[in-house]
């Protein structure tokens, strides 16, 4: 009967953590089985840049260092799975750890929005959807945005509602407005840690319609109609 | 055995925003990262960004940040890649391409999607 | 970003010659932490999409056959094929797999003289 190695679980473990991760923090485990039932220690081979540590018992992985997404993305060590007594038979996977951004984008407009319009007078209130989005990166999840009005003197003719994560309706609160043009200021708040919020405009014109489209004098293109 | 089936041709106005998709088989879906590359016409390769479809984990390129959104649909092992306000300069085909085992190269591509943006 | 330079451009000759394309990094690829060279060749024929060659700089993928050859460490990296044959005329890509955002060299065609 011969003695055997140690076998991982998966031939590469992928862990992924935020660049600003407190250090001491867990960041990722290994797992390793021995097929005669020894105890197995776990141990780090090519941390070149400090970074990590290996509970030998466990095979959790903390950072012991700040890390530094810049330094180049993904990380990886080699893991060892050695025997705890017989032959010290070893075993040998990567570790992968993969730097996320940290919440430094505050959200924004997925879209170019200029050319919204209802069509003067309107005859109901009207709505529009638009959709936020911002450059982070965001794990198991999509973002979850929350929506309000920029400020209060807004809240006599507009209201925001949120429909998703992503995307939110503007509603005017009445039918009676004038026939030019009015910038709704919009606070969208990412929720993140640090929480960041951006302000953004949305440019909307009441304007008279033939056939459907805005009415503008010649050189002028067409814009978008919105209910 | 692995196979990488993408949506057909679209031709769009500048501005506009295209959404290409590209269905997995042959494996197990969420054990692989997916990645878009793209080739304009009598060009080389250029990597856009990719997507670990077990956690929505997406790491882009930053020339592309804020116009690529890459989503995924496990139910149905579908990537989706969005990208907006197209210009004439985003004519090209663009891959799907699965990771490779253990690591980050491309093992498997898709047919490719020709997106051409013109007015 | 690591920047990737291949050369040459193209490449002309003739059948059962041998064909060397040269791929520069401009960072190590050689991950001293795992003793890997993050380096890929592949091969794209017009009208279809790549195909992998070589990955980890000198391993063959599977169905690739042995006349293609992958070496080179750190930052100079070349492909190798022993004995041309007309199947082989195409592009030829490398990339690095190292560190993020991945990137590709310019390309090299590979004609028949």
């Known amino acids: 009967d011969v003695n055997e190695a140690p076998q991982f679980s998966q031939h590469v473990f992928q862990a992924k953590v935020s660049e600003d991760v407190a250090i001491g923090t867990k960041v990722g485990n290994v797992t390793a089985k021995d097929p005669e039932g020894l105890d197995i220690s776990y141990s780090l081979r090519g941390d070149t840049r400090g970074w990590l540590k290996i509970d030998h018992v466990t095979g959790e992985i903390f950072s012991v260092a700040p890390l530094d997404r810049e330094a180049g993305s993904p990380y990886r060590v080699q893991v060892v799975a050695t025997e705890v007594g017989g032959s010290s038979l070893s075993s040998v996977s990567e570790f992968h750890l993969i730097l996320m951004d940290v919440n430094d984008n505050p959200p924004r407009l997925a879209k170019d929005y200029t050319g919204l319009f209802f069509c003067h007078p309107l005859s109901a209130p009207g709505s529009l959807i638009f959709e936020a989005t911002d450059d982070d990166q965001h794990l198991f999840r999509g973002p979850h945005f929350t929506f309000s009005l920029g400020s209060g003197s807004l809240q006599n003719d507009w209201e925001v509602s949120k429909i998703n994560g992503t995307h939110a309706r503007l509603s005017t609160r009445h039918t009676e407005f004038e026939e030019r043009e009015y910038v709704v200021l919009i606070r969208i708040n990412d929720g993140g840690r640090p929480p960041l919020e951006g302000i953004v405009s949305l440019p909307v014109t009441f304007c008279s319609c033939v056939e459907g489209s805005c009415f503008r004098p010649a050189g002028h293109k067409h814009h978008h109609h919105h209910h | 055995q692995v196979q990488l089936v993408q949506s057909g041709a679209e031709v769009k106005k500048p501005g506009a925003s295209v959404k290409v998709s590209c269905k997995a088989s042959?494996?197990?879906?969420?054990?692989?990262?997916m990645n878009w590359v793209r080739q304009a016409p009598g060009q080389g390769l250029e990597w856009m960004g990719a997507?670990?479809?077990?956690?929505?984990?997406?790491n882009y390129n930053q020339k592309f940040k804020g116009r690529v959104t890459m989503t995924v649909d496990t139910s149905t092992s579908t990537v989706y890649m969005e990208l907006s306000s197209l210009r004439s300069e985003d004519t090209a085909v663009y891959f799907c391409?699965?990771?490779?085992?253990?690591?980050?190269?491309?093992?498997?591509w898709g047919q490719g999607t020709l997106v051409t943006v013109s007015s | 970003d690591i920047v990737m330079t291949q050369s040459p451009d193209s490449l002309a000759v003739s059948l059962g010659e041998r064909a060397t394309i040269n791929c520069k990094s401009s960072?190590?690829?050689?991950?001293?932490?795992?003793?890997?060279?993050?380096l890929a060749w592949y091969q794209q024929k017009p009208g279809q999409p790549p195909k992998p060659l070589i990955y980890?700089?000198?391993t063959r993928e599977s169905g690739v056959p042995d006349r293609f050859s992958g070496s080179g460490s750190g930052t100079d990296f070349t492909l190798t094929i022993s004995s041309l044959q007309a199947e082989d005329v195409a592009v030829y890509y490398c990339q690095q797999h190292h560190y993020f955002p991945w990137t590709f060299g310019g390309g090299t065609k590979v004609e028949i003289k």
């Open positions: 980890f700089a000198s």
């Open positions: 042959g494996y197990t879906f969420t054990d692989y990262w």
């Open positions: 960072q190590n690829l050689l991950s001293s932490g795992t003793q890997k060279n993050y």
């Open positions: 997507i670990d479809p077990s956690d929505r984990y997406t």
């Open positions: 391409a699965r990771g490779g085992y253990g690591d980050y190269w491309f093992a498997n």
